[in-house]
């Protein structure tokens, strides 16, 4: 029977700046039932709080609610293991609410075949940026990104959207159903899940384009 | 302990490439963003980019863009810096530094000095 | 880009007395979401950068509190209160507001 090992605080996630989660990898538990508290300071603060909500996370998180989570002063936590023989702290860790976000997936995509009388076919979509993102403030970028395959195909075909809510694909196979995805991620967070599959059929006289796609 | 390992010295010809690498090891790898900074001799520090080891998602100082690549293996835990098109400026210790979750560089490797010359 | 400028170029110091660099960005480094990302490294000799201070004015962990940073806007200012012969070196201020991230020339600090 040993002291537990070292845990590690290993990921972190925002929605949306207003509310954060960080959660820990235990160590070993030393043979012995563990507990784990989650301790931390806000930058230029000296007092240290413990971690204000461990249910909502699931098992090993942190959850810190809206009144909990600043997006102006910088985190410092730290997790330590406790058992009968002894305790083991984590590597303290900084978290900067800005480089946390993962959003939710956009929404509303749509997908239309246009088929203009003068110009080739071409697949247009559009989408809508999560709600709950504020992109009103200006620092919140969102980038997009697209991917689509026939319906019996194994592989995706992606395309980097940037900031546009709308983006044409030129080159599709004529007869076939496609499924359409989309995501998003700010400058310097992570990549939403992917949006709900939408369906759109390509017309058999859809005309192949050697032009692969362009932005709107 | 967290610890950035970098390749060994390097001397390239001007017009050819370099790949520098930087095993991590200590943490979690693809929790935090890598970045890579170079140091010209008796100079500055230069920023050359970064990227999220977790989907390599990458972020390039214009400078360099089409001459640098960022990548990443997960499977060993390493980054790698390429620089192409090598001319005598670009002589400088290549440095991969790790941010937390933020945007400063808490972790530094030891540097990887590279030379171009003729 | 964001041209940090760094004065004195090099800097003296008997140990025990007081030190302090300037550091002054082209450009405001408070960020759209209210934070200023301005910090400064130590390069000891033969060794890589370490951090100090990030954000300003908070120490890193493991940094004596000899150190400090103060300012806003484009004006920064590291002190050490009381120099000692450990603390010789180049320091960088460098900015993380904007992208493409860029550091300051340097100051090079010296035991008399």
């Known amino acids: 029977q040993l002291p537990p090992g070292k845990p590690e605080i290993f990921k972190c996630r925002s929605p949306n700046k207003e509310t954060f989660t960080c959660w820990w990898r235990p160590g070993t538990d030393g043979g012995l039932p563990t507990n784990y508290s989650l301790t931390y300071h806000r930058e230029g603060e000296t007092l240290m709080h413990e971690c204000p909500d461990y249910i909502t996370g699931g098992p090993n998180s942190c959850h810190f609610g809206k009144q909990y989570t600043s997006m102006w002063r910088t985190y410092v936590m730290m997790v330590n293991a406790t058992n009968q023989m002894g305790s083991s702290f984590s590597d303290e860790l900084y978290v900067d609410v800005t480089y946390i976000v993962q959003p939710d997936p956009p929404l509303e995509l749509t997908v239309e075949v246009k088929q203009p009388e003068d110009r080739k076919p071409y697949l247009w979509m559009k989408w809508s940026p999560p709600t709950l993102i504020d992109l009103k403030t200006g620092w919140f970028t969102l980038l997009y990104e697209i991917r689509l395959k026939p319906e019996k195909a194994a592989e995706w075909e992606t395309h980097f959207a940037g900031q546009q809510t709308e983006f044409k694909i030129l080159s599709l196979h004529p007869g076939q159903k496609y499924l359409v995805q989309v995501r998003c991620k700010p400058d310097h967070g992570y990549w939403s899940a992917w949006s709900p599959a939408t369906f759109i059929q390509i017309p058999s006289d859809f005309i192949m384009n050697d032009h692969h796609h362009h932005h709107h | 302990e967290v610890q950035l390992v970098q390749s060994g010295a390097e001397v390239k010809k001007p017009g050819s490439s370099v790949k520098v690498s930087c095993k991590a090891s200590?943490?979690?790898?693809?929790?935090?963003?890598i970045h890579w900074v170079r140091q010209a001799p008796g100079q500055g520090l230069e920023w050359i980019g970064e990227i999220d080891p977790s989907d390599s998602y990458t972020n390039y100082n214009q400078k360099f863009k089409g001459r640098v690549t960022i990548t990443v293996d997960k499977s060993t835990s390493t980054a790698y810096m390429e620089l192409s098109s090598l001319r005598s400026e670009d002589t400088a210790v290549y440095y991969c530094a790790r941010s937390f979750f933020t945007n400063w560089f808490a972790y530094w490797g030891q540097g990887t000095l590279v030379t171009v010359s003729s | 880009d964001v041209v940090m400028t760094q004065t004195p170029l090099s800097l003296s110091v008997t140990p025990g007395q007081p030190a302090s660099i300037s550091c002054r960005s082209s450009?405001?480094?408070?960020?759209?979401?209210?934070?200023?990302?301005l910090h400064w490294y130590l390069q000891k000799p033969g060794q890589s950068p370490q951090l100090l201070i990030y954000k300003v004015s908070n120490r890193f962990s493991g940094v004596p509190d000899r150190f400090s940073g103060s300012g806003s806007g484009t004006d920064f200012t590291l002190k050490i209160s009381r120099v000692e012969a450990e603390d010789v070196g180049v320091y960088f201020c460098?900015?993380?507001?904007?992208?493409?991230?860029?550091f300051g020339g340097g100051t090079k600090v010296e035991i008399k």
């Open positions: 460098s900015q993380s507001t904007h992208v493409p991230f860029t």
């Open positions: 450009q405001s480094l408070v960020h759209s979401n209210g934070n200023t990302y």
């Open positions: 200590g943490y979690t790898f693809t929790s935090y963003w």
